[in-house]
């Protein structure tokens, strides 16, 4: 038994990473590995992640981890019963995926102007919680071609558009997701997605 | 908001022990590592025990053997206990989160040893 | 035990003058976990800098800390009348612990 692709980590710079790799063969990846892993740390103490099978020879593991920081290093054995398969470590602030943004609201009861909100997915004490921006998908369910991107680069977790740049009468859905520059994350999932019917008055034309 | 709101300071006699208390509120009490640092009068800060997420602990060597630093998840509590208590060992003590450094502190309580 | 030694003892200077402020190790120490605190009287300290250089949040950017292995630095580029108080740097290692030095006092002129 070998890893044929070593142990790929992403931290979600809160409490969970996520480890993927492949063997080069069918594994049955929750009784035959262990993932061990350590915060290097005068106060941590070894923690045991049962793998689960992604496809035939993926396996991937979710780590519990304290609170991270920026200075957080973590050593990761990969074990097949007694024999090391791979040994490695870990710098959650390196790879960094943040959580998907929650909660997202679409007000249509604002004059001709929707309000997106949605919610930070970190706590206040967080490093990331003052740090994302976010991007809102926008796209019609009719028309496959109306499709947009509003880039949020302020701090507030809210979006407002002019009803009237969407087309009146139709159906639409909106989603969001996040990243933070300072650590050169990568995007977020996607948040679920919300719709809502886009209707607004034609201002009246004059002769 | 983070908080950490100490109690259990007092006036003890050499040789007595106290206990001091550390609620947590504000963020996820079980996944961070607890701290105790002091400060004698007039003195600067002295880093006393601590205490990590699965319960390992660590003493400086001033307080090891008297002191024994706990935790309880489930109350977001940390503690110390304090026996054979000494003349030095009167100090404003402070609780902190934190972990290769204390960005979040509690207020202080006295500990006043004095026959 | 790392031994922090601050200098100087007390750093008496005016307002809007540059304070620089100096920690040296008694052996060398990861920048990673140099960090630097201010204290008031009768109150806790407040992280200032941590990882030798990295300002904490909410902390004003007069506030600098530079270094790596034995010597580090904390400098406040324009003394503001609510900086004067007492700064600490302190260490961590992974087989040592923890250490503070024994602060620097800065004070008005």
């Known amino acids: 038994m070998k890893v044929l692709q070593e142990p790929t980590c992403v931290s979600d710079y809160m409490s969970i990473s996520t480890c993927e790799w492949k063997m080069n063969g069918p594994t049955n990846c929750s009784t035959e590995l262990r993932l061990l892993y350590q915060l290097v740390f005068l106060l941590s103490e070894a923690h045991t992640c049962i793998p689960e099978n992604n496809g035939g020879a993926g396996c991937v593991c979710h780590l519990l981890m304290d609170d991270v920081v920026s200075a957080d290093n973590y050593t990761l054995d990969l074990w097949a019963g007694q024999q090391l398969l791979w040994k490695g470590s870990f710098k959650p602030s390196e790879h960094v995926k943040p959580r998907a943004p929650g909660n997202l609201t679409v007000h249509t009861n604002v004059s001709d102007t929707l309000l997106l909100t949605w919610s930070n997915p970190y706590p206040p004490d967080n490093y990331l919680y003052n740090h994302l921006t976010y991007a809102v998908n926008i796209w019609s369910e009719n028309d496959p071609a109306d499709f947009r991107i509003y880039n949020v680069t302020y701090l507030e977790p809210s979006l407002r558009i002019a009803a009237s740049t969407l087309k009146s009468g139709i159906s639409y859905r909106a989603r969001v997701r996040a990243w933070a520059q300072c650590y050169n994350t990568t995007w977020s999932e996607w948040s679920p997605s919300t719709k809502w019917h886009n209707s607004y008055r034609e201002p009246f034309e004059q002769h | 908001e983070v908080q950490l709101v100490q109690s259990g300071g007092g006036l003890v006699h050499p040789g007595g022990s106290l206990r001091l208390s550390c609620a947590g509120s504000?963020?996820?009490?079980?996944?961070?590592?607890m701290f105790w640092v002091r400060q004698a009068p007039g003195k600067g800060l002295e880093w006393v025990s601590g205490i990590g997420t699965g319960g390992a602990t660590n003493y400086a060597d001033s307080v090891k053997g008297r002191f024994t630093i706990s935790r309880d998840n489930a109350k977001n509590s940390l503690y110390l206990q304090m026996n054979s208590l000494r003349a030095e060992d009167m100090a404003v003590y402070y609780c902190?989160?934190?972990?290769?450094?204390?960005?979040?502190w509690g207020q202080g309580t006295l500990v006043t040893v004095s026959s | 035990e790392i031994v922090l030694t601050q200098s100087p003892g007390t750093l008496s200077l005016s307002p809007g003058e540059r304070a620089t402020l100096s920690c040296r190790a008694s052996q060398s120490v990861s920048s990673s976990y140099l960090a630097w605190y201010q204290q008031k009287p009768g109150q806790a300290p407040r992280l200032l800098i941590f990882?030798?250089?990295s300002r904490a949040p909410g902390i004003p950017d007069r506030f600098s800390g530079s270094g790596s292995g034995t010597d580090f630095t904390l400098t406040i580029s324009r003394l503001e009348p609510e900086d004067f108080a007492v700064y600490y740097c302190?260490?961590?290692?992974?087989?040592?612990?923890?250490?503070f030095g024994q602060g620097t006092k800065v004070e008005i002129k």
């Open positions: 902190a989160r934190g972990r290769y450094y204390f960005p979040w």
């Open positions: 504000g963020f996820t009490f079980s996944r961070n590592a």
């Open positions: 302190q260490q961590y290692d992974h087989s040592a612990g923890w250490t």
């Open positions: 990882g030798a250089s």
